[in-house]
C-alpha cells in the first residue's frame, strides 16, 4: 500500500497536467486529490503517466469510489482501464455505448479478454438487454466478443438483432451459447428461401437439433465439412448414411479426412459397415454385418 505523507506546499496540485509525471509515487499519492482526479479524468490519457503512476491514480479512484466508479469516470479511463481487474469492473454500471467503444479501443492488442468479457456483461445488464446497437458496437469494435457473454446474457438477444451478427462473430462461441442463439436465428431467418436461409443459418448450426439437421439434408444444401464438424455430436449420431450423403453432397469425400475426429468418428461407430461401404470412401469402424444392435438407452427408458 502507498504510504501516507503530507504534500509539500510547492507540490500542491490544482489541475491534472503533464507536470505530474515528474512526481514521485509518494508525492502523487499525497498531492493529488481524488475528487480532482475524477473531475479531470478526461485529461489523464493524454498525459504519459508511467505504469507505476497509474497504480497510484487507480488507488485514488478506488478509495473515492469503493462501490465502483461512476460512468462519467469510466468513460475517460483510457489506458487506466488496462489496470482494472474483472473484480473492479463487476462493480460498474455501464449503459453508454460510447463508453464501451472507448474501452474496447483501448484494450485492443492487450491481453484483456477477462476484463472485456466482464465489461460487456455489465453493459448488457446496464442496458437491460443485448439490443441491436450493442450488437453492432461489439461486431464493429470487438469481433468475437459476443461469445464472451454467458448463455444467460445471450438469451436476452431479440431474434430481430440476429441479422446483425456476422459469421466471424460466432467463431469462439461454445455449444451452450449456440444452443441459445440457434433458435433465435431460426426464427429470424424463417421467411427466407432455402439457399439464402442456409447461408444465414450456417454459423449458428452448432446449436441445431437432429431434426433440423435432417431437414437440411432434404434441401440439397451441400454443407461444407467445417460446418458439419461443428454440429453437436448428439445431432449427428442419429443421422443415417444416406442423410449424411445428401447433407454433404460433393463434400462427402471430406469424411475420410475427418475419420478419426469427433463427431465423424462417433457417427461411424454407430453405422453399419455395409452402409458406410456404399459411400466408397473406405471408412472403417462401422458395425460388422450380421451384428444385432440393442439400444439399451431406449430399453432403460421404457422400464
Amino acid at each position: 500500500d502507498v504510504e501516507r505523507t503530507t504534500c509539500p506546499p510547492e507540490k500542491e496540485v490544482h489541475e491534472i497536467d503533464e507536470s505530474l509525471i515528474f512526481y514521485k509515487k509518494r508525492e502523487l499519492e499525497a498531492c493529488v486529490d481524488a475528487a480532482l482526479l475524477a473531475a479531470q479524468m478526461d485529461r489523464v490519457d493524454a498525459i504519459p503517466f508511467t505504469y507505476e503512476q497509474l497504480d497510484v491514480l487507480k488507488h485514488k479512484l478506488d478509495e473515492l469510489y469503493p462501490q465502483g466508479y461512476p460512468e462519467s469516470v469510466i468513460r475517460h479511463l483510457g489506458h487506466l482501464f488496462l489496470k482494472m481487474s474483472p473484480e473492479d469492473i463487476r462493480k460498474w454500471n455501464v449503459t453508454s455505448l460510447e463508453t464501451l467503444k472507448a474501452l474496447l479501443k483501448v484494450s485492443k492488442g492487450h491481453e484483456m479478454s477477462a476484463q472485456v468479457a466482464t465489461l460487456i456483461d455489465r453493459v448488457v445488464v446496464g442496458r437491460g438487454q443485448l439490443d441491436k446497437d450493442t450488437v453492432d458496437t461489439l461486431t464493429a469494435f470487438c469481433p468475437g466478443c459476443l461469445c464472451s457473454l454467458s448463455p444467460e446474457r445471450l438469451s436476452s438477444v431479440p431474434p430481430s438483432v440476429i441479422g446483425a451478427v456476422r459469421p466471424q462473430d460466432l467463431d469462439t462461441c461454445g455449444p451452450r451459447q449456440l444452443d441459445v442463439l440457434y433458435p433465435k436465428a431460426r426464427l429470424a431467418f424463417q421467411n427466407m428461401s432455402g439457399s439464402e436461409y442456409f447461408v444465414k443459418i450456417r454459423p449458428f448450426l452448432g446449436g441445431a437439433p437432429t431434426e433440423d439437421v435432417k431437414a437440411l439434408s432434404q434441401q440439397n444444401v451441400s454443407m461444407d465439412l467445417a460446418t458439419f464438424m461443428k454440429l453437436r455430436r448428439e445431432a449427428v449420431l442419429p443421422l443415417t448414411v444416406a442423410e449424411v450423403q445428401k447433407l454433404l453432397g460433393p463434400h462427402v469425400e471430406g469424411l475420410k479426412v475427418e475419420e478419426q475426429h469427433s463427431p465423424v468418428r462417433d457417427w461411424i461407430l454407430k453405422q453399419r459397415q455395409d452402409d458406410l461401404d456404399t459411400l466408397g470412401l473406405g471408412l472403417q469402424g462401422g458395425i460388422p454385418n450380421g451384428y444385432l444392435i440393442l439400444d439399451l438407452s431406449v430399453r432403460e427408458a421404457l422400464s
Epitope: 504510504e3 509525471i21 514521485k24 509515487k25 509518494r26 504519459p48 508511467t50 505504469y51 507505476e52 485492443k108
Partner: antibody, heavy 120, light 106 residues
Framework: DVQLQESGPGLVKPSQSLSLTCSVT?????????WNWIRQFPGNKLEWMGF???????NYNPSLKNRISITRDTSKNQFFLKLNSVTTEDTATYYC?????????????WGQGTLVTVSA | QIVLTQSPAIMSASPGEKVTMTCSAS?????MYWYQQKPGSSPRLLIY???NLASGVPVRFSGSGSGTSYSLTISRMEAEDAATYYC?????????FGGGTKLEIK
C-alpha cells in the same frame, strides 16, 4: 516479432546536429506504445533521452530538453532523433527501443545500436 | 531524478555458484526492471515488474525486492551469464538506469 534498426552517420562534428533514424518492423508506431531513444556512453552509463508516443506526442529527458527533438514518419513506420549543438560529450552508442507495456515502464525491444562519434 | 546504485560494481563467480547483485533506489519504487548486456550487443530485458521473467529468460534468473532495495539472483551461474547487468526504474520521469554490475566467470 518487433524489430528496430538504427541508422545514421557515425561521425558528427562538434556544434552540428546529430540525426538518427529508427526503422520499425513487426509493429506499427501508431499501435499504442512508446518509442524511445536511449544512449550508452563509452563508460557504459545508460541514459534515456526521450520518446514519441503512439499519438505523436513527445517527452524528453529534462537534461536534454533544449537540444532534442523526436519526430516520426508513420507512412514509413520510422521515428527520428535530432540532437542539436553536439559536443564530444555526446559520443555514445544510440539505441532505439520500444517499451513493453501500455504505459512507460520497461524497454522490451531494442535496436542493435549505432555508434556516433563527435569529433572535429 | 531517482538515482539507482548497483553493487558490487564487479564480481566473479564459478559455474554452479549462486549469484546475487543489488540495486538501491534513492526513492521508494513499486517496480524494478533488470537487463543483461554482453559486449557488442544491446541490453536484453531479463526481469520486469520486479520479479517477472521476460520471454525466453532461463528460470535460474529471479528478481525480488520492494521499496528502495531490489536484487537479481542467478541460482546457478553458467558461463553464458558472464555479462553486465543493469537495473532500471520508471517510477517517475525521467527513467534512470543503475551503473551496472559486471559479472565475470571464474
Amino acid at each position: 516479432d518487433v524489430q528496430l534498426q538504427e541508422s545514421g552517420p557515425g561521425l558528427v562534428k562538434p556544434s552540428q546536429s546529430l540525426s538518427l533514424t529508427c526503422s520499425v518492423t513487426g509493429d506499427s508506431i501508431t499501435s499504442g506504445y512508446y518509442w524511445n531513444w536511449i544512449r550508452q556512453f563509452p563508460g557504459n552509463k545508460l541514459e534515456w533521452m526521450g520518446f514519441i508516443r503512439f499519438d505523436g506526442t513527445n517527452n524528453y529527458n529534462p537534461s536534454l530538453k533544449n537540444r532534442i527533438s523526436i519526430t516520426r514518419d508513420t507512412s514509413k513506420n520510422q521515428f527520428f532523433l535530432k540532437l542539436n549543438s553536439v559536443t564530444t560529450e555526446d559520443t555514445a552508442t544510440y539505441y532505439c527501443a520500444r517499451e513493453g507495456s501500455y504505459a512507460p515502464a520497461w524497454f522490451a525491444y531494442w535496436g542493435q545500436g549505432t555508434l556516433v562519434t563527435v569529433s572535429a | 531524478q531517482i538515482v539507482l546504485t548497483q553493487s558490487p560494481a564487479i564480481m566473479s563467480a564459478s559455474p554452479g555458484e549462486k549469484v546475487t547483485m543489488t540495486c538501491s533506489a534513492s526513492s521508494s519504487l513499486s517496480y524494478m526492471y533488470w537487463y543483461q548486456q554482453k559486449p557488442g550487443s544491446s541490453p536484453r530485458l531479463l526481469i520486469y515488474d520486479t520479479s517477472n521473467l521476460a520471454s525466453g529468460v532461463p528460470v535460474r534468473f529471479s528478481g525480488s525486492g520492494s521499496g528502495t532495495s531490489y536484487s537479481l539472483t542467478i541460482s546457478r551461474m553458467e558461463a553464458e551469464d558472464a555479462a553486465t547487468y543493469y537495473c532500471q526504474q520508471w517510477s517517475s520521469y525521467p527513467p534512470t538506469f543503475g551503473g551496472g554490475t559486471k559479472l565475470e566467470i571464474k
